[in-house]
């Protein structure tokens, strides 16, 4: 039976013999932001019984992670490139707090977490270079992000624990619809 | 262990309306990342995607075909059925559901159905 | 639509041979290229995907190589289970497309 790169793949496609465009450039280094995620969830499921958990959706409450939804105009149907991309950069930059929350979270993965995060970034520079309406941006207000940082790390254990494995989770698959919406820009 | 079984009527009459159904088991439809596909093969010829569907219901279709088809999921039954109208003779193929995606989003079939051969015919 | 013409339409090798199968896209499609397998009666078999990459449970003398145009898959020693059709498929960009199969029968 095939098995293809997974959540417990390193395997990134094969060097190339000639020169990226800017789309194929972008979409192999969400693949590796997508492998070190991967990485990171390897540890969290193993050092804990959180990805079995059914006691997601009170946590999740607490929590208000980017999705992508169908009037993020993302989807095939009413596809919108400009609102699109809008969305998925104002999406990566809500995402940064929760980054910064990882990074003490790890014992084993410290580098592979710091380096999700700092491939997060460069994704977000190489995704304002493309978009056309710079404006319609919104960078999410520091005070507010210290204020939720600090919340955050004030929780329980298990909360901690529960958190962790949400944003790691929500953050796989906004890459994931980002892939594929961009393969269509 | 990954499975994918077609089911549907073998025999069609031009004009009419075929409705599949692919069963799955071993993956949840509603993985990130993870999608179901359908692909055609007429006797003796090639392979040509028809549509698929992923994990949070985004569609896409093969334009050429795209009036006449319509996907969709039913994820706690673990199903996918693809309808294609006003059938020709033309479209005797056998379909195959295939599973699609992975963490990548890949746009690649890993695992297949064995298929089911459609007849269109008066 | 990207168009993937594979050649030749039929390779007519002995078992122990080496099988070159060919596949040239219509525009770039970078290393977004995969491979199929297709005996008489089955469903297609993932061989290879993004143009070299192997996948556990196929065989070794399976390789893929090339990107951009032009793509190769080798088959190192042809074993009796490998006479069938090979199908590549444009993974880049909608609609996918497949080549039309290499047909790898026995000399």
């Known amino acids: 039976a095939p098995v293809l790169p997974g959540e417990d793949s390193k395997n990134v496609a094969a060097p190339h013999s000639q020169p990226l465009t800017s789309s194929e450039r972008i979409d192999k280094h969400i693949r590796y932001i997508l492998d070190g995620i991967s990485a990171l969830r390897k540890e969290t499921c193993n050092r804990s019984n959180m990805c079995e958990s059914s006691k997601e959706a009170l946590a999740e409450n607490n929590l208000n992670l980017p999705k992508m939804a169908e009037k993020d105009g993302c989807f095939q149907s009413g596809f919108n490139e400009d609102t699109c991309l809008v969305k998925i950069i104002t999406g990566l930059l809500e995402f940064e707090v929760y980054l910064e929350y990882l990074q003490n979270r790890f014992e084993s993965s410290e580098e592979q977490a710091r380096a999700v995060q700092m491939s997060t970034k460069v994704l977000i520079q190489f995704l304002q270079k493309k978009a056309k309406n710079l404006d319609a941006i919104t960078t999410p207000e520091p005070t507010t992000n210290a204020s939720l940082l600090t919340k955050l790390q004030a929780q329980n254990q298990w909360l901690q624990d529960m958190t962790t494995h949400l944003i790691l989770r929500s953050f796989k698959e906004f890459l994931q619809s980002n892939l594929r919406a961009l393969r269509q820009m | 262990q990954v499975t994918l079984k077609e089911s549907g009527p073998v025999l069609v009459k031009p004009t009419e309306t075929l409705t599949l159904t692919c069963t799955v088991s071993?993956?949840?439809?509603?993985?990130?990342?993870?999608?179901v596909g359908w692909i055609r093969q007429p006797p003796g010829k090639a392979l040509e995607w028809l549509a698929h569907?992923?994990?949070?219901?985004?569609?896409r279709y093969n334009s050429a075909l795209k009036s006449r088809l319509t996907i969709s999921k039913d994820t706690s039954k673990s199903q996918v059925v693809l309808t294609m109208t006003n059938m020709d003779p033309v479209d005797t193929a056998t379909y195959y559901c295939?599973?699609?995606?992975?963490?990548?989003?890949?746009?690649?079939?890993?695992?297949w159905g064995q298929g089911t051969l459609v007849t269109v015919s008066s | 639509e990207i168009v993937l013409t594979q050649s030749p339409a039929t390779l007519s090798l002995s078992p122990g041979e080496r099988a070159t199968l060919s596949c040239r896209a219509s525009?770039?499609?970078?290393?977004?290229l995969h491979w199929y397998q297709q005996k008489p009666g089955q469903a297609p078999r993932l061989l290879i995907y993004?143009?070299?990459q192997s996948i556990s449970g196929i065989p070794a003398r399976f390789s893929g190589s090339g990107s951009g145009t032009d793509f190769t898959l080798t088959i190192s020693s042809l074993e009796p289970e490998d006479f069938a059709v090979y199908y590549c498929?444009?993974?880049?960009?909608?609609?996918?497309?497949f080549g039309q199969g290499t047909k790898v029968e026995i000399k």
């Open positions: 295939a599973r699609i995606g992975g963490l990548y989003v890949d746009y690649l079939m890993d695992y």
């Open positions: 071993g993956f949840s439809l509603s993985t990130s990342g993870m999608g």
């Open positions: 569907i992923w994990w949070d219901d985004d569609k």
């Open positions: 525009q770039s499609i970078s290393d977004y």
């Open positions: 993004y143009a070299s």
């Open positions: 498929q444009n993974g880049h960009s909608f609609p996918w497309t």
